[in-house]
Amino acid sequence: APVLPGEDSKDVAAPHSQPLTSSERIDKHIRYILDGISALRKETCNRSNMCESSKEALAENNLNLPKMAEKDGCFQSGFNEDTCLVKIITGLLEFEVYLEYLQNRFESSEEQARAVQMSTKVLIQFLQKKAKNLDAITTPEPTTNASLLTKLQAQNQWLQDMTTHLILRSFKEFLQSSLRALRQM
């Protein structure tokens, strides 16, 4: 079964050494989640031809996946530590409903999907501790999330496969941008 960072012997150094610092934990968690996404993408691509599909735009119109934009202050030009951290946390909170949707979408990688979801929750907690400006972080409405989940699950098979592919791809891009940005913090 997948093991969260900090739980296996490789991540917990010998008892006499210091525990992971906040930035080490965050870095390790993001890289762990990215590894999990790679495994899930592998199953998705093997199962369907979505990874080569040119019809992504069709499905993308129905999704409102979090994306980094210039105004979020996470890119090299116009980088802003505070604004960017708020965007990363807000984006991860918005991704949670999509990660919930992924839970029933995998057969051989079911545990991996759960581990990605759980590790993302832990990552959000670490980042919230780091953030000074918590007031600026908006949490998605539970009712909105519930109706979005219902809507996504009601799609036909092709759209569900495409949605799964797009969620994984977008989440990977979001995390990669976050990782780069967090390394300047």
Epitope: A13, S17, Q18, L20, T21, S23, E24, D27, Q76, S77, G78, F79, N80, E81, D82, K132, L179, R180, A181, R183, Q184, M185
Partner: antibody, heavy 120, light 111 residues
Framework: EVQLVESGGGLVQPGGSLRLSCAAS????????MSWVRQAPGKGLEWVSR????????YYADSVKGRFTISRDNAKNTLYLQMNSLKPEDTAVYYC?????????????WGQGTQVTVSS | QSVLTQPPSVSGSPGKTVTISCAGT?????????VSWYQQLPGMAPKLLIY???KRASGIADRFSGSKFANTASLTISGLQSEDEADYYC??????????FGGGTKLTVLG
């Protein structure tokens, strides 16, 4: 063209203080974490301190913790190192360095350095 | 003293290949892919050659390459040229939000 120009070095007595400055130009200073690295005469390099792009997080080598303070003024594109309780072993050339974007702890641009001598 | 161990000196003839090692521990070199290498010409500031173990910095010739196995990193310079004569330093992230350098290696190009 990226430029980092250090100033403020000089001769100081043990127990004294100095404030180093580093004027940055040719890049968006506020987008980068910055650091100070020193090199004692005829010796190797030693990492001293790091500050995050917005100045929120600071990190120090054990050898300077509690004596040195790193800070930055993004409006002035300037990095600082306030050095108190100086010791003879702090004698070195102090380099202002920029962290490579999105990379964990690699320094892609260095200033020419400013000499700090601690002696009575 | 330096935390990472490098040979004080290495030498090689023009056109040949030299490798400089950088030995650390599981808390620094072995912790992640966070090793970088720097070249310092006499009287100059250091210059980034390699970062993230094996990625070349912008404008660096492909004669320079980096690698890592367990707690030891290596810099390999092939097709040695007289202008490569310099001091070379490895650096690594160290557990606890620190950075550490090696003691430096003086490269002499013979002939």
């Amino acid at each position: 063209e990226v430029q980092l120009v250090e100033s403020g070095g000089g001769l100081v007595q043990p127990g004294g203080s100095l404030r180093l400055s580093c004027a940055a130009s040719g890049f968006t200073f506020s987008s980068y974490a910055m650091s100070w690295v020193r090199q004692a005469p005829g010796k190797g390099l030693e990492w001293v301190s790091r500050i995050s792009s917005g100045g929120i997080s600071t990190y120090y080598a054990d050898s300077v913790k509690g004596r040195f303070t790193i800070s930055r003024d993004n409006a002035k594109n300037t990095l600082y190192l306030q050095m108190n309780s100086l010791k003879p072993e702090d004698t070195a050339v102090y380099y202002c360095v920029r962290y490579a974007w999105g990379v964990q702890w690699a320094f892609d641009f260095w200033g020419q350095g400013t000499q700090v001598t601690v002696s009575s | 003293q330096s935390v990472l161990t490098q040979p004080p000196s290495v030498s090689g003839s023009p056109g040949k290949t030299v490798t400089i090692s950088c030995a650390g521990t599981s808390s620094d070199v072995g912790y992640g892919n966070y090793v970088s290498w720097y070249q310092q010409l006499p009287g100059m500031a250091p210059k980034l050659l390699i970062y993230d173990v094996n990625k070349r910095a912008s404008g660096i010739a492909d004669r320079f390459s980096g690698s890592k196995f367990a707690n030891t990193a290596s810099l390999t310079i092939s097709g040695l040229q007289s202008e490569d004569e310099a001091d070379y330093y490895c650096a690594s992230y160290k557990r606890g939000d620190n950075a550490v350098f090696g003691g430096g290696t003086k490269l002499t190009v013979l002939g």
